[in-house]
């Protein structure tokens, strides 16, 4: 959901508190407040539709609701690309499009949305319970992925409403670390305000703006996907048997992160950039590939001519590779 926070006007500290706290002590709370309030909420939506003409033909549409520039889009099925999913297409805004069977044609619909038509025959053809995932790599937000599938009882020609991702997958501990700092900061800020003001600390209230507020093409997010927010990662089998819902955890690791709030993910951008970096919202989860910015101290790629999903040792301009970043 793209909820915005309306912040009540905050009074400056009372004179009596100024001496006790000092100007320097006030800096942290205000910086934290700015971070807490201004953090944006990029989101990815996915819409899956079965064509009425060909019952086993699917159209997948995905879009990115964020202010950054998209550097790469990866579409997969059977789960996210790095977690057992099968690549269907990779779209680079400048360099081109690559697709894998049974994808028939991938294309950009707008500068921030794509569509993919899947063939309806053959052993690798999709079926109604298949999960399709779209990952958008963007600057400066990072990598965002959402998954969706047709509802079990979909009529041909009908489409599932766009589904924001029902889970958060943080591939880098750093994300959680910064998230924790932010979360702690916000709590600390509220604590300070409560402690040093006579009146109760102001609470950030979600805007009354409807979640379906103008989104690219007025897609409405499905409530079903919101109900699944507690599932850290949903994998639906690609065979045409009844779908099984698996909760996948990091390989060989505990499931301690499964209960993390999906709005707490944050990807550090660098010394100065992180202050304005949007924090993922509940509908999408941030996924930063382990190798994304890890190469030889490279800065996060900017999509000059084109960015790729994977790091490019040649430097900023060269970062325009394929699957991920060049």
């Amino acid at each position: 959901m793209r909820t915005e926070a309306q912040v009540p006007a905050l009074q400056p500290p009372e004179p009596g508190l100024e001496g006790a706290m000092g100007h320097r002590t006030l800096v942290l709370p205000w910086v934290l407040l700015t971070l807490c309030v201004t953090a944006g909420t990029p989101e990815v939506w996915v819409q899956v539709r079965m064509e009425a003409t060909e019952l086993s033909s699917f159209t997948i549409r995905c879009g990115f609701l964020g202010s950054g520039s998209i550097s790469l889009v990866t579409v997969s099925w059977g789960g996210p690309n790095g977690a057992g999913g099968t690549t269907l297409a990779v779209l680079h805004p400048e360099r081109g499009i690559r697709q894998w069977a049974p994808a028939r044609q991938a294309r950009w619909e707008t500068q921030s949305s794509i569509s993919l038509i899947l063939e309806g025959s053959g052993a690798s053809s999709p079926c109604a319970n298949t999960t399709f995932c779209c990952k958008f790599a963007s600057f400066p937000e990072g990598s965002w992925e959402a998954c969706g599938s047709l509802p079990p009882s979909s009529d041909p020609g009908l489409s599932a409403p766009p589904t924001p991702a029902p889970i958060l997958r943080a591939d880098l501990a750093g994300i959680l670390g910064v998230s924790g700092v932010l979360l702690f900061g916000c709590v600390y800020l509220l604590h300070l305000l409560r402690r040093h003001k006579h009146r109760p600390a102001p609470r950030l209230q979600p805007s009354r703006t409807s979640p379906q507020a103008p989104r690219a093409r007025a897609w409405a997010p499905s409530q079903a996907s919101q109900a699944a927010l507690h599932v850290p990662y949903a994998t639906i089998n690609t065979s045409c048997r009844p779908a099984t819902l698996d909760t996948a955890h990091p390989h060989g690791g505990p499931s301690w992160w499964a209960s993390l709030p999906t709005h707490a993910a944050h990807r550090p951008q660098g010394p100065a950039a992180w202050a304005s970096t949007p924090i993922p919202a509940r509908g999408s989860f941030v996924s930063v590939e382990n190798g994304l910015y890890a190469q030889a101290g490279e800065r996060p790629p900017h999509t000059g001519p084109g960015l790729t999903l994977f790091p490019d040792p040649r430097g900023p301009r060269a970062m325009e590779g394929p699957l991920g970043v060049r």
Partner: antibody, heavy 114, light 113 residues
Framework: QVQLQQSGAELVRPGTSVKVSCKAS????????IEWVKQRPGQGLEWIGV????????NYNEKFKGKATLTADKSSTTAYIQLSSLTSDDSAVYFC???????WGQGTLVTVSA | DIVMTQSPSSLSVSAGEKVTMSCKSS????????????LAWYQQKPGQPPKLLIY???TRESGVPDRFTGSGSGTDFTLTISSVQAEDLAVYYC?????????FGGGTKLEIK
Amino acid sequence: QVQLQQSGAELVRPGTSVKVSCKASGYAFINNFIEWVKQRPGQGLEWIGVINPGSGDANYNEKFKGKATLTADKSSTTAYIQLSSLTSDDSAVYFCASHWLAYWGQGTLVTVSA
Amino acid sequence: DIVMTQSPSSLSVSAGEKVTMSCKSSQSLLSSGNQKNYLAWYQQKPGQPPKLLIYGASTRESGVPDRFTGSGSGTDFTLTISSVQAEDLAVYYCQNGHFYPYTFGGGTKLEIK
């Protein structure tokens, strides 16, 4: 820096098969797909197919289905193309390339001769 | 499959001259959604692998001299070398980067007088 090092020239008999390797270095192998391109002597370029080394997913030009098989070994960051049932038409230089064809291997000459 | 037709098949120019070569595709390579043309140009010198010069029809690849310029949209594209140098002796290929399979043109051979 990015490098794609291909295996040496091959002289093979008709009807047999050959496997050409492409060792990648200097970048995140699993995050960049590898494409293969064929060039017959004195001729133009033909796109054979593409593989995502991270997942092993490959897609082929219809013309090369059944002829070429693309694979990748993540542990050695090496991509392979296997050509089967070789005929004289398969005699060519085979190139691997990555990063949307921005980086190319030096090419491997495959000569099919009785 | 998309057919890429290049012309002329060869041309001979003197160093310092301006040269243009054409590439036509059988289907538009313009992505209407984001208004980008998915066409690339490659240079292949004798005995070497191809080298990417231009992608997105007009974006110069890193390290490519600015005498190389790509232009065009839809089905008609042009590669221009503003002042040909001796080292530009090569075959130049265009490639469709939009539609599978990602076909190449037949090439234009540039010779230096």
